[in-house]
Interface confidence: low
């Protein structure tokens, strides 16, 4: 036998209180699939949490953050602070990197410079809070037509740059 | 590279105590060092943490006021005042797993093996 | 403050067995969540760090999975050597957090 409640589309519930009929959902609430019993709470997007996709019947509210703030989390589940390029969040707010480390971005840890010197090449141009070091070529790398600068090292996610 | 924590008595109540972690191996100013304690036969208990590169402090809420952590180039201190028999316990001190100030590297990956203080009249 | 809850207080199973290790945060720690393991008389020892990233030397048995505000340790293929308490530790200070306790409450893991 098949359920009634199967023929609810996304956007309704199967309203037990009324015989199995399928009911629009209320305000402020939403179901994205079929079917469903109740209709689940819309997300609010509140305090320092922007709406970037308003709540429908079958979709749920999506959030960004305010400008000075970026997301953290599964869907945006938290919003935290930026920092300038060449310092990084710490538990006392934003402070610069220190001697020797590069942030080049308004999120994640300051990272050390990279060190030309293990790879056998001299130092083109002198690191920054804010930038890495830039390594010319290996003294035997200078033939004509070959590139001058080495990139940057990749940026690494926070909690895992070297020691 | 390790850390060694020393200190740990016998004091009466009221007294004032001050732990010491000391370090070997590497330079405290780059890293968050914590306290942590652990009474007989009960979990851990964060007391607060410094980070050696600014010297900023940190502690849980009820230990604020009473309990006050500094450090020097390869100290870390906890001093400790007012003592109840509450306050019996291991102390631990612990060095962060990677250096620099960002709160993503505040997890523990070296630890002393503690010093016992007992509170008791 | 944010609160850190694990549950179970204690769980017994047997040797080749599974446990799972609940922690709960009182609200979202995105990622930033740890897991450590004690035995009696030794200092704590970092299992996994970043929700699921183990640290070198510690057993793929080990997983770690979660996010936001609820975290899994599960301990497969048991062995006698993992008898141990189990914490977990929440470390995201953004937006001004504040935790009375960083760890949890522990978890006894007694293998039979």
């Known amino acids: 036998l098949q359920d009634p409640c199967s023929n609810c589309p996304a956007g309704t519930f199967c309203d037990n209180n009324r015989n199995q009929i399928c009911s629009p959902c209320p305000p402020n609430s939403f179901s994205s699939a079929g079917g469903q019993r109740t209709c689940d709470i819309c997300r609010q997007c509140k305090g320092v949490f922007r709406t970037r996709k308003e709540c429908s019947s079958t979709s749920n509210a999506e959030c960004d953050c305010t400008p000075g703030f970026h997301c953290l989390g599964a869907g945006c589940s938290m919003c935290e602070q930026d920092c300038k390029q060449g310092q990084e969040l710490t538990k006392k707010g934003c402070k610069d990197c220190c001697f020797g480390t590069f942030n080049d971005q308004k999120r994640g840890i300051c990272r050390p410079w990279t060190n030309c010197s293990l790879a056998g090449k001299p130092v083109l141009m002198n690191g920054t809070k804010a930038r890495d070091v830039v390594c010319g070529p290996r003294p035997a790398d200078l033939s004509p037509g070959a590139s001058s600068v080495t990139p940057p090292a990749p940026a690494r996610e926070p909690g895992h740059s070297p020691q | 590279q390790s850390v060694e924590e020393s200190g740990g008595r016998l004091v009466t109540p009221g007294t004032p105590l001050t732990l010491t972690c000391t370090a070997s191996?590497?330079?405290?100013?780059?890293?968050?060092m914590i306290w942590v304690r652990q009474a007989p036969g009960e979990g851990l208990e964060w007391i607060g943490d410094?980070?050696?590169?600014?010297?900023t402090t940190d502690y849980a809420s009820w230990a604020k006021g009473r309990f006050t952590i500094s450090k020097t180039s390869t100290t870390v201190d906890l001093k400790m005042t007012s003592l109840t028999t509450e306050d019996t316990a291991t102390y631990f001190c612990?060095?962060?797993?990677?250096?620099?100030?960002?709160?993503?590297?505040?997890?523990?990956?070296?630890w002393g093996q503690g010093t016992l203080v007992t509170v008791s009249s | 403050d944010i609160v850190m809850t694990q549950t179970p207080a204690s769980v017994e199973a047997a040797v080749g067995g599974t446990v799972t290790i609940k922690c709960q945060a009182s609200?979202?720690?995105?990622?930033?969540l740890a897991w450590y393991q004690q035995k009696p008389g030794q200092p704590p020892k970092l299992l996994i760090y970043?929700?699921?990233t183990l640290e070198s030397g510690v057993p793929s048995r080990f997983k770690g999975s979660g996010s936001g505000t609820e975290f899994t340790l599960t301990i497969s293929d048991l062995e006698s050597a993992d008898a141990a308490t189990y914490y977990c530790?929440?470390?995201?200070?953004?937006?001004?957090?504040?935790?009375?306790?960083?760890f949890g409450g522990g978890t006894e893991v007694v293998v039979k």
């Open positions: 612990a060095r962060a797993r990677y250096s620099g100030g960002s709160y993503a590297n505040y997890v523990f990956n070296l």
């Open positions: 191996g590497f330079t405290i100013s780059s890293y968050h």
């Open positions: 410094i980070y050696g590169g600014t010297a």
């Open positions: 609200q979202s720690i995105s990622s930033y």
């Open positions: 970043r929700t699921s």
């Open positions: 530790q929440g470390y995201d200070w953004s937006s001004s957090n504040r935790y009375d306790n960083t």
